[in-house]
């Protein structure tokens, strides 16, 4: 059928609570595409009726809630103007009773459910809650060994639990809980997180990686509109800023009056081991003064540039 197959690493999930998966693969979902979800190679698409327990919500598949029998391989088919991609997602559902210590740990936990705090540092845990816009999440509560976390060393900030002056006693089993509301119904989301402590300073000095641009030139005609993405991978809990600069000045400040060149709104896709961030720069109209100038994408300490250049003349036209 001419679709390119892409395989998601297995997702292991907890029964009896909501779960959502967004059909996104950055190289192909950035343009005009249609997305359709299927289960186990069925020819019948997943329902789009919001009252259905399992339904497609825009590019997401949403389980309200997930049940043990929902395990299986789901496919989302992404159709673009001149391409088709089929993403296979293997969902394994298990029963987990968070406070029952007689039951073993989670099987093959992904990094979202295994997190590290750094001894003696101020650090944080993240509650990974990935749901479509139709789902409204209430405030998050945090638990350690099934007791709600209290104390001045702990601060809840949006989806994070800030832990100051991490000690060895902070290792253990945590859970974050939120109430999700969808179409007037409420559901509990409870994510377990196994926390270990390390003495190594933060993430081995992990540096954001700029995937694109790659310090290269782009041929572009005078007067055209141009949009260039800066794609950056970084750790899940990074605090790096990402932006476009020219002449060491933020493009929005540099072109404050004309607004001819603007930085776009940053978006990100959460992957298992990292986040992929995208922030674009838009040239509403390329002018002569733009050629030869390095437009720099900054991500923390990492930088990469593009340089616009006039296309070589096409003598065949004469």
């Amino acid at each position: 059928d001419g679709c390119k197959d892409i395989f998601m690493k297995n997702e292991i999930l907890s029964a009896s609570q909501p779960f959502a998966f967004n059909c996104t693969f950055p190289p192909i979902t950035s343009g005009e595409v249609s997305v359709t979800w299927y289960k186990n190679s069925s020819k019948i698409p997943v329902s789009k009726i919001i009252q259905s327990r399992i339904h497609q919500d825009e590019t997401w598949i949403l389980f309200l809630p997930m049940e043990w029998g929902d395990s299986g391989v789901y496919q989302c088919v992404i159709k673009g103007r001149d391409s088709c991609h089929r993403i296979h997602v293997n969902l394994t559902v298990f029963e987990k009773h968070w406070c029952d210590t007689s039951i073993g740990g989670l099987p093959n936990l992904s990094d979202e459910y295994k997190q590290i705090l750094h001894l003696g540092k101020d650090d944080s845990l993240t509650c990974h809650l990935h749901f479509p816009k139709s789902c409204v999440l209430g405030p998050i509560k945090w638990y350690k060994d099934c007791n709600e976390i209290k104390g001045e060393r702990f601060t809840v900030l949006e989806t994070r639990l800030l832990v100051s002056n991490v000690s060895a006693e902070d290792r253990g089993n945590y859970a974050c809980q939120a109430i999700l509301t969808h179409s007037g119904k409420q559901y509990e989301v409870l994510n377990g997180i196994t926390v270990s402590i390390t003495e190594r300073a933060g993430y081995g000095g992990s540096v954001p990686k700029i995937i694109y641009p790659k310090n290269h030139s782009i041929e572009v005609q005078l007067g055209t509109t141009l949009i260039v993405d800066c794609n950056v991978t970084d750790t899940k809990d990074n605090t790096n800023l990402r932006c476009w600069r020219v002449n060491n000045t933020l493009v929005d400040d540099y072109y404050d009056e004309s607004k001819r060149i603007r930085e776009g709104v940053e978006t990100h896709v959460s992957f298992r081991e990292h986040n992929l961030y995208t922030v674009n720069i838009t040239f509403l109209e390329v002018k002569m003064e733009d050629y030869g100038l390095p437009f720099m994408c900054h991500a923390g300490v990492s930088t990469a540039y593009i340089i616009l250049q006039l296309p070589a003349p096409d003598f065949r036209a004469y």
């Epitope: 001419g2 390119k4 892409i6 693969f25 391409s83 993403i87 992957f271 992929l276």
Partner: antibody, heavy 125, light 107 residues
Framework: EVQLQQSGPELVKPGASVKLSCKAS????????MNWVRQSHGKSLEWIGR????????KYNQNFKGKATLTVDKSLSTAYMQLNGLTSEDSAVYYC??????????????????WGQGTSVTVSS | DIQMTQSPASQSASLGESVTFTCLAS??????LAWYQQRPGKSPQLLIY???SLADGVPSRFSGSGSGTQFSFNIRSLQAEDFASYYC?????????FGGGTKLEIK
């Protein structure tokens, strides 16, 4: 530094089998597909197939089904290709090549960003 | 299988010149196309992936363009080390297939 180190040249008789190896280092072996590619003398490149080192799943070019068998040993970070029923047509240089993969939550076919140095196989009586 | 037709099969050029090769896919492959350089007696080396993206460490004089079924590869200001064979490859669907190659020779 990513490296793919292939086994040495092979001189084999028609009808025999040979097992080539490709040892990976400098990255997590199970994160990327390993491909095998054939190049006959003075010719273009032919994709034989690929193996997913994390679970051993394989995908073959139909032209090489029954001819090539792809396996891995995760503990040795090594991929293998066994070639069976060799004829003079199989005389070529065989390369292993790692699939480039930015999005580490996914596995998919993509360009090969690192290649082994190649193993020359000569089939002659 | 998707056929990849590369042209020209060979080309002569001088140092400092620019050259362009083309690659035609027998069906649409989006931008799932790679370009490789192979010097005599050596392994192929990835230059371009995703039709237009420069691989790590590859000089910016190499560039790729195109999507769907028609693709181009350009080298500007040829250097001595650029004289080699070049292959396109579709990675849209298995079996992955290569073009027949373009041999770039010094004039």
């Amino acid at each position: 530094e990513v490296q793919l180190q292939q086994s040495g040249p092979e001189l084999v008789k028609p009808g025999a089998s040979v097992k080539l190896s490709c040892k990976a280092s400098g990255y997590t072996f199970t994160d990327n597909y390993m491909n095998w590619v054939r190049q006959s003398h003075g010719k273009s490149l032919e994709w034989i197939g690929r193996v997913n080192p994390s679970n051993g799943d394989t995908k073959y070019n139909q032209n090489f089904k029954g001819k090539a068998t792809l396996t891995v040993d995760k503990s040795l970070s090594t991929a293998y290709m066994q070639l069976n029923g060799l004829t003079s047509e199989d005389s070529a240089v065989y390369y292993c090549g790692r699939t480039k993969n930015f999005y580490s939550s996914y596995s998919y076919d993509d360009a090969m960003d690192y290649w082994g140095q190649g193993t020359s196989v000569t089939v002659s009586s | 299988d998707i056929q990849m037709t590369q042209s020209p099969a060979s080309q002569s050029a001088s140092l400092g010149e620019s050259v362009t090769f083309t690659c035609l896919a027998s069906q649409t492959i989006g931008t799932w196309l790679a370009w490789y350089q192979q010097r005599p007696g050596k392994s192929p080396q990835l230059l371009i992936y995703a039709a237009t993206s420069l691989a790590d460490g590859v000089p910016s004089r190499f560039s790729g363009s195109g999507s769907g079924t028609q693709f181009s590869f350009n080298i500007r200001s040829l250097q001595a080390e650029d004289f080699a064979s070049y292959y396109c490859q579709q990675v849209y669907t298995t079996p992955l297939t290569f073009g027949g190659g373009t041999k770039l020779e010094i004039k």
